[in-house]
């Protein structure tokens, strides 16, 4: 025999207390699939959370974060404070990146500058708290006969003329 509850569409629940009729989900609750025996309580976007999408009888509310915060976790389960670029969030609040590290976003941690010499390259633009270093061509790339890459004038090394 077919379960009578399977006929209950999204937005309703199979009410066992009332001969398994399909009762509409009460306000502030929803069922996103058919055949459900209860409706789920709608998520409330309160405090630092704000409503991105309202709840309906067939779908849960979706939250994001108020300005100055950003989402973390599946479905924006948490809101974390933004910091400025060049900072990272610590237990004591936003702190500037230490020398040799940078953060170009309002979230996340400070990461070490790229070590250009590991790739045999030179530093083209120095790093800052907000930006990574820019690695230039390797010294070999700048020798006569190499492919015609024209490095910016300020980065020219002594004794090398533009190709």
């Amino acid at each position: 025999l077919q379960d009578p509850c399977s006929n209950c569409p999204a937005g309703t629940f199979c009410d066992n207390n009332r001969n398994q009729i399909c009762s509409p989900c009460p306000p502030n609750s929803f069922s996103s699939a058919g055949g459900q025996r209860t409706c789920d309580i709608c998520r409330q976007c309160k405090g630092v959370f704000r409503t991105r999408k309202e709840c309906s009888s067939t779908s849960n509310a979706e939250c994001d974060c108020t300005p100055g915060f950003h989402c973390l976790g599946a479905g924006c389960s948490m809101c974390e404070q933004d910091c400025k670029q060049g900072q990272e969030l610590t237990k004591k609040g936003c702190k500037d990146c230490c020398f040799g590290t940078f953060n170009d976003q309002k979230r996340g941690i400070c990461r070490p500058w790229t070590n250009c010499s590991l790739d045999g390259k030179s530093v083209l633009v120095n790093g800052t708290k907000e930006r990574d270093v820019v690695c230039g061509p390797s010294p070999a790339d700048l020798s006569p006969g190499a492919s015609s890459v024209t490095p910016p004038a300020p980065a020219r090394e002594p004794g090398h003329s533009p190709q």
Epitope: P9, G11, D15, I21, C22, P24, P26, P27, S56, S57
Partner: antibody, heavy 122, light 109 residues
């Protein structure tokens, strides 16, 4: 403009049939909005007839007294709901209202049509 | 579900506090709506979920109650409030959405 407009009322003889229509504009019936029918005999109380699920399922909720005589149906492509009334009696004479029962308003009737008068008389 | 409203009519003056009661034949939790109807017009939703004011309804209207006993209160009656008031169960199901038979509020004197 968000509105409900009923049509199809008029004079009908006892034992006859009538089909009322309720056209929705400015919104669509859905799982959040159920179309319902309510009637009011002259000088009498409001009387609930029934509602139909607003989405694609044909689940209806009806007052027991309507069984076998009144049927609610819906055409989603036309965003219209119907009330088929058979074996009409003098006591069915009333203004028939179409109403929107909304999840957002605790399933209260937050939007009503202007009503259409049905007179059952020989 | 049967809904019993009382009184069936009452007379009051502008500024009066008016209370109308509605009783359900079985528990309907907070699933109750109140409507106002004026002659020749369709009903207008005032309150839903027992005590939530519908959009655009003045704050002098309030609703309370849960289970089987509910109350509509008009804190200070205004000239435009003379009308008939209905309660309705919104506890969906067959026969679940019955109306009370109304309370007519008329001018005293």
């Amino acid at each position: 403009e968000v509105q409900l407009v009923e049509s199809g009322g008029g004079l009908v003889q006892p034992g006859g049939s009538l089909r009322l229509s309720c056209a929705a504009s400015g919104f669509s019936f859905s799982a959040n909005y159920y179309p319902c029918w309510v009637r009011q005999a002259p000088g009498k109380c409001l009387e609930w007839i029934g509602c139909i699920y607003g989405g694609s399922s044909d689940i209806t909720y009806d007052a027991q007294w309507t069984k076998g005589r009144f049927t609610i149906s819906r055409d989603n492509s036309k965003n219209t709901v119907y009330l088929q009334m058979n074996s009409l009696r003098a006591e069915d004479t009333a203004v028939y209202y179409c109403a929107r029962s909304a999840w957002y308003s605790g399933w209260g009737g937050d939007l009503w049509g202007q009503g259409t008068l049905v007179t059952v008389s020989s | 579900i049967q809904m019993t409203q009382s009184p069936s009519s009452l007379s009051a003056s502008v500024g009066d506090r008016v209370t109308i009661t509605c009783q359900a034949s079985q528990s309907i939790s907070n699933r109750l709506a109140w409507y106002q109807q004026k002659p020749g017009k369709a009903p207008k939703l005032l309150i839903y979920s027992g005590g939530t004011l519908a959009s655009g309804v003045p704050s002098r209207f309030s609703g309370s109650g849960s289970g089987t006993d509910f109350t509509l209160t008009i804190s200070s009656l205004q000239p435009e409030d003379f009308a008939t008031y209905y309660c309705q169960s919104t506890y969906y199901g067959n026969d679940g959405n019955a109306f009370g038979c109304g309370t007519k509020v008329t001018v005293l004197g």
